[in-house]
Amino acid sequence: HLYPGEVCPGMDIRNNLTRLHELENCSVIEGHLQILLMFKTRPEDFRDLSFPKLIMITDYLLLFRVYGLESLKDLFPNLTVIRGSRLFFNYALVIFEMVHLKELGLYNLMNITRGSVRIEKNNELCYLATIDWSRILDSVEDNYIVLNKDDNEECGDICPGTAKGKTNCPATVINGQFVERCWTHSHCQKVCPTICKSHGCTAEGLCCHSECLGNCSQPDDPTKCVACRNFYLDGRCVETCPPPYYHFQDWRCVNFSFCQDLHHKCKNSRRQGCHQYVIHNNKCIPECPSGYTMNSSNLLCTPCLGPCPKVCHLLEGEKTIDSVTSAQELRGCTVINGSLIINIRGGNNLAAELEANLGLIEEISGYLKIRRSYALVSLSFFRKLRLIRGETLEIGNYSFYALDNQNLRQLWDWSKHNLTITQGKLFFHYNPKLCLSEIHKMEEVSGTKGRQERNDIALKTNGDQASCENELLKFSYIRTSFDKILLRWEPYWPPDFRDLLGFMLFYKEAPYQNVTEFDGQDACGSNSWTVVDIDPPLRSNDPKSQNHPGWLMRGLKPWTQYAIFVKTLVTFSDERRTYGAKSDIIYVQTDATNPSVPLDPISVSNSSSQIILKWKPPSDPNGNITHYLVFWERQAEDSELFELDYCLKGLKLPSRTWSPPFESEDSQKHNQSEYEDSAGECCSCPKTDSQILKELEESSFRKTFEDYLHNVVFVPRKTSSGTGAEDPRPS
């Protein structure tokens, strides 16, 4: 009963339905299933298509622009589990721009183990409000279900039996509303007793064995599960794989020869991107983790003595890193056999991504070229780079080459970083924010001092737009209140005091004291500092009575730690020597103050002598809240209440239904509009700044997701005519 068909690899089915038949005998898709970009399909094309054997997808299910598909109830009638081992942008189920889809209909879907659900822009899609997602996955709050027909209240979702006045389906509470749960007009949502947890239950409601996941045909029997909570071995669900078996892909047990076959298949094939599987911690995994290397006799990962070398040989001797994706191809490499060219114009979360993928590189056999990388602020993402051999050099005999990097301000933090360049010269031109002092420091540290010729390091085009400080500014006075910080610092004057144009004060919220000026920044980033320009103080001739420059920072958040530093702004001197000074980063916390009022107080009387009062914490605690004060006062009774005859025929039932405390924002909006209509004279309030900000964030989040979707989904046609897993994927 358990997984009756085959285990199939992940599939990307696009353009037409021909490849869909590859799903025919699949019980498990080990990977993801993407069905997308079918513009010529019609409803009748899907009529006789059904894959009843499919029970589990280990990664994610993505449906995008498949025309004519109206329901998934016949396509995947027995899909029970989506494990979400690997997710699509944090989602395990994505239904996006499915123009004809009327209902999901995945009536056997019982568990999404990891990740959440994104159902967006499906303008015919109903039966969404009738699904209790909390019975299927844990992180319901991360679901993103918007811009579907269901949003417009145009859906007449009718669960089985409703038409005959019966309630056949289980009802559960969401947002205080007790609603019948169903997937379609003929399929209830199966709601097991909560005591069964995610193990599932039989049709009669008895809990499955604790090793089951989602469903079973008999209770208390690990061989009668529909899917396994942990691992599958020989027709049985088990908690862990016993020797001589190994855990594979987070869901099944395999023996040594299975893992060995995978290893050799990849080793012997010329296919790029396949994995030479290895054994580590009782698992058969694609590669040894960081710090381990493979013992070729038994495929076991053994700890490296010292750092593990992972030599990456570059095709054609060099590789251009122009995106995070190309950087990912070097993930885990410690030695680069060849040369690297960094040419990064933009991207998302760049510094962190580059460090994650290039941060282990210790050695480059050829040269390193940083060219027109407008997005880079620092090279500190090359966290472990210690050696550039220069065995092959860039034209002109350069082993380190930096050209036209508009925002590059720091190479490395030379107090913490050592770099040796065995042979070859340095080249620096058109790096306007990179101070010459930084370049000269690199010459000293890397051992290249004296190798450079006159024009290798341009004096006019490096650091010409930077404030290149060489003195330390010290803060002399700091005072705080709940929303202000008053700062003063020691005066600084360059040799010609007229060169001092003023000071720049940089600050930002910093919950942790780990902020640096450049780390984690990129020129496209949003983690920038707030900058205040401050005029220089009046200059006194008496050095003892010099005014200390300063600034009163206003409008700060109470009880918040700020990172602050200050630097000088000086004119560019003709002698090509720019003076300046900069402080260390300091951390200052504003004082606490009164919290804002507690939100949404709701009072409900649950008996003749009790009132239950609930509220939400204030939006701005402005400190550590230790307690709340509750005041009450007895009110005089309204005499009308006693005099009214409650049996009067004319009395109408209250028209407003009672809504429970803390209902969702959506239902609050709905109530609001009702009142506005009835009043007739009221207009809706203008949106608050926080509402506007929230909407902007939401819109930006939507765009990010769409960009991600398009980048993943639309791929150029391959010229080779591969088959199977290597099928050309037209866009």
């Epitope: 289980p170 009802a171 559960t172 509470v173 007790f178 709601v191 007793p193 909560t194 005591i195 069964c196 009669e204 409601g205 008895l206 809990c207 064995h209 604790s210 090793e211 209770p219 208390d220 029997d221 690990p222 908690e239």
Partner: antibody
């Protein structure tokens, strides 16, 4: 045939502890949860908690947390319940019963009398 | 916790009659209610679970109905061996809770 055989009646002094057993036969012991239920004299039934013999995981009724401890010995297919700091309130018949939720097989009960 | 109110506490009937026992839950428990029979000197017997599913080996004169908060056990054409104590129990959520019981006596 499925059977749950419970240990015999006990008389204990207040403040003492007692550990009773429930030996299972006729099915795979590790496949079904074991429940424990209290029935005070002339009163209804009260669920104490359950244990999953497969992995030792337990769920307790809040009223019995700290009072009852559930354990199993897989090798002998036996479930145990220990009651500590006994008072006269703990005098009752204690049943073990198989299966999570709707309990399909019950033991004959162990009578515990707490008296000085 | 889900409170279960069972009624009546006592019920006298004669063989051949049909009787009903009711249980009401303090909140919805879907269909997840079980019925047990308790007889002196015998182990407790599961009769019905999930509101209406008959446990194997139980005669078909026993039937259950209801969902949400209101449930009923019906015994049609009573047999002499049916005179016993009956309990209902919700098996939807922890902690599992029982009704106070109904004593079915011979009239």
């Amino acid at each position: 045939e499925i059977q749950l055989q419970q240990s015999g009646p006990v008389l204990v002094k207040p403040g003492a502890s007692v550990k009773m057993s429930c030996k299972a036969a006729g099915y795979t012991f590790t496949d079904s949860y074991m429940n424990w239920v209290k029935q005070s004299h002339g009163k209804s039934l009260e669920w104490i908690g359950d244990i999953n013999p497969y992995n030792g995981g337990t769920s307790y009724n809040q009223h019995f947390k700290g009072k009852a401890t559930l354990t199993v010995d897989k090798s002998s297919s036996t479930a145990y319940m220990e009651l500590n700091s006994l008072t006269s309130e703990d005098s009752a018949v204690y049943y073990c019963a198989r299966r999570r939720g709707a309990m399909d097989y019950w033991g004959q009960g162990t009578s515990v009398t707490v008296s000085s | 916790d889900v409170q279960i109110t069972q009624s009546p506490s006592y019920l006298a009937a004669s063989p051949g009659e049909t009787i009903t026992i009711n249980c009401r839950a303090s909140k919805s428990i879907s269909k997840y209610l079980a019925w047990y029979q308790e007889k002196p000197g015998k182990t407790n017997k599961l009769l019905i679970y999930s509101g209406s599913t008959l446990q194997s080996g139980i005669p078909s004169r026993f039937s259950g109905s209801g969902s949400g908060t209101d449930f009923t056990l019906t015994i049609s054409s009573l047999e002499p061996e049916d005179f016993a104590m009956y309990y209902c129990q919700q098996h939807n959520e922890y902690p599992l809770t029982f009704g106070a019981g109904t004593k079915l006596e011979l009239k």
